[in-house]
Amino acid sequence: QLLEPCGYIYPEFPVVQRGSNFTAICVLKEACLQHYYVNASYIVWKTNHAAVPREQVTVINRTTSSVTFTDVVLPSVQLTCNILSFGQIEQNVYGVTMLSGFPPDKPTNLTCIVNEGKNMLCQWDPGRETYLETNYTLKSEWATEKFPDCQSKHGTSCMVSYMPTYYVNIEVWVEAENALGKVSSESINFDPVDKVKPTPPYNLSVTNSEELSSILKLSWVSSGLGGLLDLKSDIQYRTKDASTWIQVPLEDTMSPRTSFTVQDLKPFTEYVFRIRSIKDSGKGYWSDWSEEASGTTYEDRPSRPPSFWYKTNPSHGQEYRSVRLIWKALPLSEANGKILDYEVILTQSKSVSQTYTVTGTELTVNLTNDRYVASLAARNKVGKSAAAVLTIPSPHVTAAYSVVNLKAFPKDNLLWVEWTPPPKPVSKYILEWCVLSENAPCVEDWQQEDATVNRTHLRGRLLESKCYQITVTPVFATGPGGSESLKAYLKQAAPARGPTVRTKKVGKNEAVLAWDQIPVDDQNGFIRNYSISYRTSVGKEMVVHVDSSHTEYTLSSLSSDTLYMVRMAAYTDEGGKDGPEFTFTTPKFAQGEIE
């Protein structure tokens, strides 16, 4: 059998607005007073098991005590009324949970969406957190009929239980209620058809056109409530490797359609497409994007000829020479398709010409010492590029005109080359480069630049701390001009090793030091200067700096009959490196001198 409590706290379910004051009272039963020989002054109030300070407590009469809290902020507090029986023993009389929070704000931003094939979902902004159990009810009605209430689980949205009826306006609002108050949102009035979010278009397919390499035809299936709605589309596309989408102008896809031709595309390029739809009036919501579909535009003839150059091999006697014609494969953006082969035509005179069909990117031919004209065209499935034409002059002709003020410099991790054009109109420029090494031959790479270019960067994969020999040749209608060369580094480093110094001649008071240039493979940069450090075993070290053009230096004012230690360092723009230490001893007497 449950024991009757000794008293009660009022209110029994206290809910307080945060920041406000609150008073609770504890009323003891008469029987309790007599049984425990107590009165209200024996009451001890506690919050979460901690005694409430006396100044918050008031004894109203022998049975009743009150407690007052100002600026309540804790969300939940266990409030208990206790009596001190027999002077010391604390006995719980009654306990309540005091909650604090806020009345609901008026819900705002009420919006509804009809996801095709589903019931209507409405969402709203409930405003500030109430910290209390708050019920949100979505109400909806026609002018003449109420619909079932929708009780929100999360307080921010609710999906109604009934299927929407289109082309009839509905009124919708939200009611919010908790222990501290009740409030309604503004109502919204709309036709559910204007809130439809269609299912994404599907079966998107992409086909190309043999006639036009710049178009792709799209077709798809739209739902639109099973044909009940006319939908307009939004089409986006990108090249396969791009991350940003290109927008087809919305005005081009305003009318309801299930196909579209995208224009101004690049030939032989793979494009990815996606599409979404919305009611043609623009009301409602865009569908999610369709699954992506891709297609490749048809090939077109190559848009330009390959870069074209030649190298003459050592002569086979006097009658003819071997010439290696070389060209670069076109980038995809210019090949406009799969390059099947190249057509090379060599013409010696009007009557003598030879045509070659080549699948690679070079051709070695034997030519007499006459002037030749070589033409090169790339061919794909659709056709041939325009021809690149090179005049190969007689070897007896001396090339005139070369570029001037040739410079090379590293910038932004690229090796740049610039020059001043020659005074005669140029057809194009050829840049050739290779790594200078004493251990391996100079394997050349090359590139072609248009006649208008006088500054460019080398487009190969260059290595740091390697010496590049760069050659620039202007090409004229009559053939190549003179070549200008220079050396350059993409990035310098300190030398890999320092110079090895030796003595060439040692006298009583001077010594001629000599050294070899550091091999180019170990230089790692331009050697700007040398330093020579020399000292005796007891003296302080002396340092002299020597220009990089020297390979000898004379140390003077040396002491006779003395051991000297010498070391040399070589410096690039990026630092220095010491060579090995070398020792020599000056003689006690000069030549012919007697003790």
Epitope: Q318, E319, Y320, V352, Q354, Y356, N366
Partner: nanobody, 125 residues
Framework: QVQLQESGGGSVQAGGSLRLSCGIS????????MGWFRQVLGKEREGVAA????????VYADSVKGRFTVSQDSSKNTVYLEMNGLKLEDTGMYYC??????????????????WGQGTQVTVSS
């Protein structure tokens, strides 16, 4: 591997005829012109006739003009030398040669890079 193989040589009476054939194989690109040369023991090899593989134009040594005819069958990769009115001085080893030099057809020996093994022609009285 480039190969030139002559055939059709032999012995013939003065005033008689012979037809030499040269089969060519192994070329990536066809030669620009083909030639026939002959060599008599102890003498320089001399040009007899040559034909352009493209246009079919031909040249002859003065000593054989009007008697010898050079021709080709592109489909069979074969070059022929038709020799009529053979003389005693036509005796010698006949070689087929191929040139890849892009120039007018010529019997200049220095312009030829590829040679056959030769076939013997003997003219007797």
């Amino acid at each position: 591997q480039v190969q030139l193989q002559e055939s059709g040589g032999g012995s013939v009476q003065a005033g008689g005829s012979l037809r030499l054939s040269c089969g060519i194989s192994g070329f990536t690109y066809r030669p620009t012109f083909m030639g026939w040369f002959r060599q008599v023991l102890g003498k320089e090899r001399e040009g007899v006739a040559a034909i352009s593989t493209g246009g079919g134009s031909s040249v002859y040594a003065d000593s054989v003009k009007g008697r010898f005819t050079v021709s080709q069958d592109s489909s069979k990769n074969t070059v022929y030398l038709e020799m009529n009115g053979l003389k005693l001085e036509d005796t010698g080893m006949y070689y087929c040669a191929a040139s890849t030099v892009i120039t007018s057809v010529s019997i200049n020996r220095a312009l030829y890079q590829y040679w056959g093994q030769g076939t013997q022609v003997t003219v007797s009285s």
